[in-house]
């Protein structure tokens, strides 16, 4: 059941010409690297996972979401230093006892081979060669992503 | 000190024509409401603060950042029901013992009159009439924002 504000919002929006929607990201902004249909920003500084999530959000982007093993490998190929860890948008959901991407989907167990424990306050980082479970309070770098493909007709799922 | 990957990224980007940068958000996407130079999305569902932050991030947006009292009032005018609470992008930083926006800036004490305690695990919600400190685990609605102004020449601060 939608509140009046939501009905109002939907009415206003649906009465508008849909071609006025967001034109999408045609090219990557300065300092962002293109990787296929995404723009990636590798942080210079370190933060716990939650602050990294907030940083990407304020940049109107998301902590990195990795679709499959192929995307993981291509992302890892951009990491030059073997020892550096980067947060991605995956953490352990205690209530669901599973790894959960920040978009709400669960990890397909075949996608990533995670080193470390699946437990409370665990978040996922990637290095040049591996995927690690770390305490979310650990201060490491992080990767933000923006979708590069135009999102003109992208309708966000009901939040 | 920049890593080789970051130097490489900067070199690649600076050699590109800067007009290829993100054209910005010219109009609000469907279901989003325009409020001055922002697009706002009022959620339909409920979540703790952290999940709300993640939701906005995956929508390539930010939990609402409020510049001043005037913007607060205009946002509150969009809320129809007096009792409904919405998360915004402000929470209590225990280490700094202060309210902190998710973009890293601190609350100007004159901006918002917060009802409730400034303590660990406290996050800020707004209603039609007030600003409340609630436990961050409280499951309520939330507001995401996208900047409407073109960000062609916007260079993200060193992250």
């Amino acid at each position: 059941q939608k509140s009046s504000i939501e009905k109002c919002s939907v009415d206003i929006q649906q009465s508008r010409n849909k071609t006025t929607e967001r034109p999408g990201l045609l090219n990557c902004p300065i300092y962002w690297q293109q990787l296929r249909e995404k723009c990636l920003l590798f942080s210079h500084t370190v933060n716990p996972w939650n602050n990294s999530l907030a940083d990407c959000s304020t940049k109107e982007s998301s902590l990195l979401l990795i679709r499959d093993k192929d995307e993981l490998i291509h992302t890892q190929n951009l990491i030059r230093d073997k020892a550096i860890l980067f947060w991605i948008g995956l953490n352990f959901s205690l209530s669901e006892k599973n790894w959960k991407w920040i978009n709400g989907s669960f990890l397909n167990s075949n996608d990533l081979e995670i080193r470390g424990d699946a437990k409370e306050n665990s978040c996922i980082s990637i290095s040049q060669t591996s995927v690690y479970s770390e305490y979310c309070s650990t201060e490491i770098r992080w990767i933000c992503q923006k979708e590069l493909t135009p999102v003109r007709n992208k309708v966000y799922p009901d939040s | 000190q920049k890593s080789s990957i970051e130097k490489c990224s900067v070199d690649i980007q600076q050699s590109r024509n800067k007009t290829t940068e993100r054209p910005g958000l010219l109009n609000c996407p469907i279901y989003w409401q325009q409020l001055r130079e922002k697009c706002l999305l009022f959620s339909h569902t409920v979540n703790p603060w952290n999940n709300s932050l993640a939701d906005c991030s995956t929508k390539e947006s930010s939990l609402l950042l409020i510049r001043d009292k005037d913007e607060l009032i205009h946002t509150q005018n969009l809320i129809r029901d007096k009792a409904i609470l919405f998360w915004i992008g402000l929470n209590f930083s225990l280490s700094e013992k202060n309210w902190k926006w998710i973009n890293g800036s601190f609350l100007n004490s004159n901006d918002l009159e917060i009802r409730g305690d400034a303590k660990e695990n406290s996050c800020i919600s707004i209603s039609q009439t007030s600003v409340y400190s609630e436990y961050c685990s409280t499951e309520i609605r939330w507001i995401c924002q996208k900047e409407l102004t073109p960000v062609r020449n916007k260079v993200y601060p060193d992250s």
């Epitope: - | 409920v46 409904i84 009802r115 436990y135 409280t138």
Partner: antibody, heavy 122, light 108 residues
């Protein structure tokens, strides 16, 4: 239609246990804080416990803490109250109640079941 | 715990009368207050929330006011179906949620 239906009440001896259930229908159960509230015969209302939409946050009145356990199954649209170590003073009609959506832990109960009577007596 | 004191505990009134019930909180609760109506053998019904917001479907003769510690429920013109017991409830984040002792509105 939108409703809550409690079940599981009955007569139990002091020290015994009961499990109350509440079946929800007609609304998106997983989006609401749910509570149990009781009313002793001829007396006023007493809030017993609440559970958040995801089940992650739970609270109890001091009078039942350590003895009662609230839980929910969003897939089954059901709320539960496991009552152990029952006492005579737990005798009451137990209501399942829904809170207004998105007022967080400020629980205004906008939908109530008809209640189920729990009698604790030897 | 936050105590809520309702007064009067009972009131006798006639159809058409204006009835006022008060609820006093032992400490400030902002506008986090609700009013319920309960008839014998029935579950309570939400009338007012956030101190003054009329719940959907509730007749406009019911109104609520107040903030902080002092609150009022007013029935502008009592109808036969309004004879019942009325409870206030505080819903701050300070647990437990507490109800007032109730006010019984009886036929004069």
């Amino acid at each position: 239609q939108v409703q809550l239906v409690e079940s599981g009440g009955g007569l139990v001896q002091p020290g015994g246990s009961l499990r109350l259930s509440c079946a929800a229908s007609g609304f998106t159960f997983s989006q609401y804080y749910m509570s149990w509230i009781r009313q002793a015969p001829g007396k006023g209302l007493e809030w017993v416990s609440y559970i958040s939409p995801s089940g992650a946050t739970i609270a109890y009145a001091d009078s039942v803490k350590g003895r009662f356990t609230i839980s929910r199954d969003n897939a089954k649209n059901s709320l539960y109250l496991q009552m152990n170590s029952l006492r005579a003073e737990d005798t009451a009609v137990y209501y399942c109640a829904r809170s207004l959506m998105s007022t967080g832990t400020h629980l205004y109960f906008d939908l109530w079941g008809r209640g189920t009577l729990v009698t604790v007596s030897s | 715990d936050i105590q809520l004191t309702q007064s009067p505990s009972s009131v006798s009134a006639s159809v058409g009368d204006r009835v006022t019930i008060t609820c006093r909180a032992s400490q400030g609760i902002s506008s986090w207050l609700a009013w319920y109506q309960q008839k014998p053998g029935k579950a309570p019904k939400l009338l007012i929330y956030a101190a003054s917001v009329l719940q959907s479907g509730v007749p406009s003769r019911f109104s609520g006011s107040g903030s902080g510690t002092d609150f009022t429920l007013t029935i502008s013109s009592l109808q036969p179906e309004d004879f019942a017991t009325y409870y206030c409830q505080q819903v701050t984040s300070f647990l437990p949620y507490t109800f007032g002792g109730g006010t019984k509105v009886e036929i004069k």
